[in-house]
Amino acid sequence: KSPIFGPQEVSSIEGDSVSITCYYPDTSVNRHTRKYWCRQGASGMCTTLISSNGYLSKEYSGRANLINFPENNTFVINIEQLTQDDTGSYKCGLGTSNRGLSFDVSLEVSQVPELPSDTHVYTKDIGRNVTIECPFKRENAPSKKSLCKKTNQSCELVIDSTEKVNPSYIGRAKLFMKGTDLTVFYVNISHLTHNDAGLYICQAGEGPSADKKNVDLQVLAPEPELLYKDLRSSVTFECDLGREVANEAKYLCRMNKETCDVIINTLGKRDPDFEGRILITPKDDNGRFSVLITGLRKEDAGHYQCGAHSSGLPQEGWPIQTWQLFVNEESTIPNRRSVVKGVTGGSVAIACPYNPKESSSLKYWCRWEGDGNGHCPVLVGTQAQVQEEYEGRLALFDQPGNGTYTVILNQLTTEDAGFYWCLTNGDSRWRTTIELQVAEATREPNLEVTPQNATAVLGETFTVSCHYPCKFYSQEKYWCKWSNKGCHILPSHDEGARQSSVSCDQSSQLVSMTLNPVSKEDEGWYWCGVKQGQTYGETTAIYIAVEERTRGSSHVNPTDANARAKVALEEEVVDSSISEKENKAIPNPGPFANEREIQNVGDQAQENRASGDAGSADGQSRSSSSKHHHHHH
């Protein structure tokens, strides 16, 4: 007997689709080996139709896929647009050839069944309503009209024109006629449930001259739509329940044995497991809404249902839509820490991943807010200016091509704690989230700027120093001038070869920035920071105010244009083997963001079109040069 297991018989009808799951034993070899689906011919040969190596036969082109779920030890073959030609014997199996471990599957595709001509079939989804049309002859116009439901022995009254209504249809069934047409009556039944399915007879008149019509009402549970998503990516449940429930509260719930536990609804309920990574967005007035979940976890896999009811809870007889979500652990989205810790007054540098194939996409950073239905207003973006309340302390550094951009937030307060999302206007699967935790600082910051109350005098020379600990010696130090389009790194070049000294004097490690001469445009926020290659570390910020020179102060001759601003970077040289990676704050954003929010992001990006990306030249009118001096103490 084969250790592979699956459905022995699969039957469907033309135009439908099948999803065949094959189970394999839990071994590392099995998880990584080739998976295939082949069709058995009369000769016993099995011709590959699709395999996990990327092969897809011509007859399956555009209508089939094969997905491996190594964490579940399963693979799934999805085939759409079935025809009777698909009827046959197949194998699902593992191995480099089609003679490996396999399981026989018989697939039968039949024609759509013909319906008896004397019966009118109504097919409706659960929770919807049906209007049954009952024609009759003129002579039965004055007679009683009725609809009854067939049971084993009799036909049980549903409703009649004398206003008799079966108790289980009270408030749900209506018998009426339209306009002046005296040859048809109608029965409307709302909030359909499974129990309403069956055969009905509508009748006008009594005895042999009565008009009768057979009706077959089929009430379908909605098909669960299959969703295959990668670990750490995001999923959007698009729910379209129809205009009749447009004004009802909406919900998304997850099946749990006998109940469906609400994850989020429009009345403000939200499952704590989804805190920081879920949004519910009403789309329009037609009952359409969507729920976005980001940072997918393995345990998010399952059976989801959306619906509408005034209670915001699942209710029988109300429309629903269902999905079966699979979460594939073989994910292209890098695994990063999902929690970043900072301290008050300190800074964090958050590395946001994006699809490396989309390096030119616009990058954004937003803060998830849970009030109401949840939303994520953009705080900064490659073409979106920094929000006012983040002036001087937030910047986005785009590093084209390497699949990461960095967001730096400094001057942290406890109010900054919360959930943030990294997103782009490109591949929506790469939305990621991080939780920022901010603790009260218990020691001095690693980077300190002096003087702290910086006021520079117009036309004079002004120097600020940034003190850093020995552990940052081997890292690159930089100063940048902040603007709401980014933090423009001030250029520098190293004029002396690095030397090392045995001891490290904590008090003498500093990098200085000199403005010479000071101009009005120099006013603003400046950051001192450390980085290693493209990996940004800690930063600290200082605001430099520029004042007119007071009387009696010495006059400084303006220097030539090239030397108007000089940034002198001075460093104490220490043993480069000391390098602690502390407080690196490279998080694991777990993917997210909402379509509508992204749309808004796009609109905002249009409004705030900047001349250059954050981290590149920000259009300053002055050039800066810098020198690297090494002092030995």
Epitope: F5, P7, Q8, E9, V10, S11, S12, I13, D16, S17, V18, S19, I20, Y23, N72, T74, I126, H194, L220, A221, E223, P224, M255, K257, E258, C260, G302, H303, Q305, E316, T322, Q324
Partner: nanobody
Framework: EVQLVESGGGLVQAGDSLRLSCAAS????????MGWFRQAPGKEREFVAT??????????YYADSVKGRFTISRDNAKNTVYLQMNSLKPEDTAVYYC?????????????????WGQGTLVTVSS
């Protein structure tokens, strides 16, 4: 709540046939699979057959020990699942339980089923 009621068990000779029925009632909205398990005296409950459905598509799963002899089917309108057992053997003697649930994972696993019937006894004498 879903209620499952089995019927059709009894005493038969080896080689004979028997048809078991399982009728589901109640909130069957999220039931996408129904199946049969059996438990012989002193043994663990084991998978026999399951039928899963999705719209007009049916998936039938069988244990190796019953392949070719047992057939599972369902009547959608009646919310009923049947197990046609042919060529019965003495080793098929057991209490047969009907099970139902969303069955999103492996249909051979007991935990995939949310609801269980009381069981019907099938005895096959040699």
């Amino acid at each position: 709540e879903v209620q499952l009621v089995e019927s059709g068990g009894g005493l038969v000779q080896a080689g004979d046939s028997l048809r078991l029925s399982c009728a589901a009632s109640g909130r069957t909205l999220t039931t996408y699979g129904m199946g049969w398990f059996r438990q012989a005296p002193g043994k663990e409950r084991e998978f026999v057959a399951t039928i899963k459905w999705s719209g007009s598509t049916n998936y039938k799963y069988y244990a190796d020990s019953v392949k070719g002899r047992f057939t599972i089917s369902r009547d959608n309108a009646k919310n009923t699942v049947y197990l046609q057992m042919n060529s019965l053997k003495p080793e098929d003697t057991a209490v047969y339980y009907c099970a139902a649930g969303t069955v999103l994972g492996d249909p051979r696993v007991l935990n995939e089923y949310d609801y269980w019937g009381q069981g019907t006894l099938v005895t096959v004498s040699s």
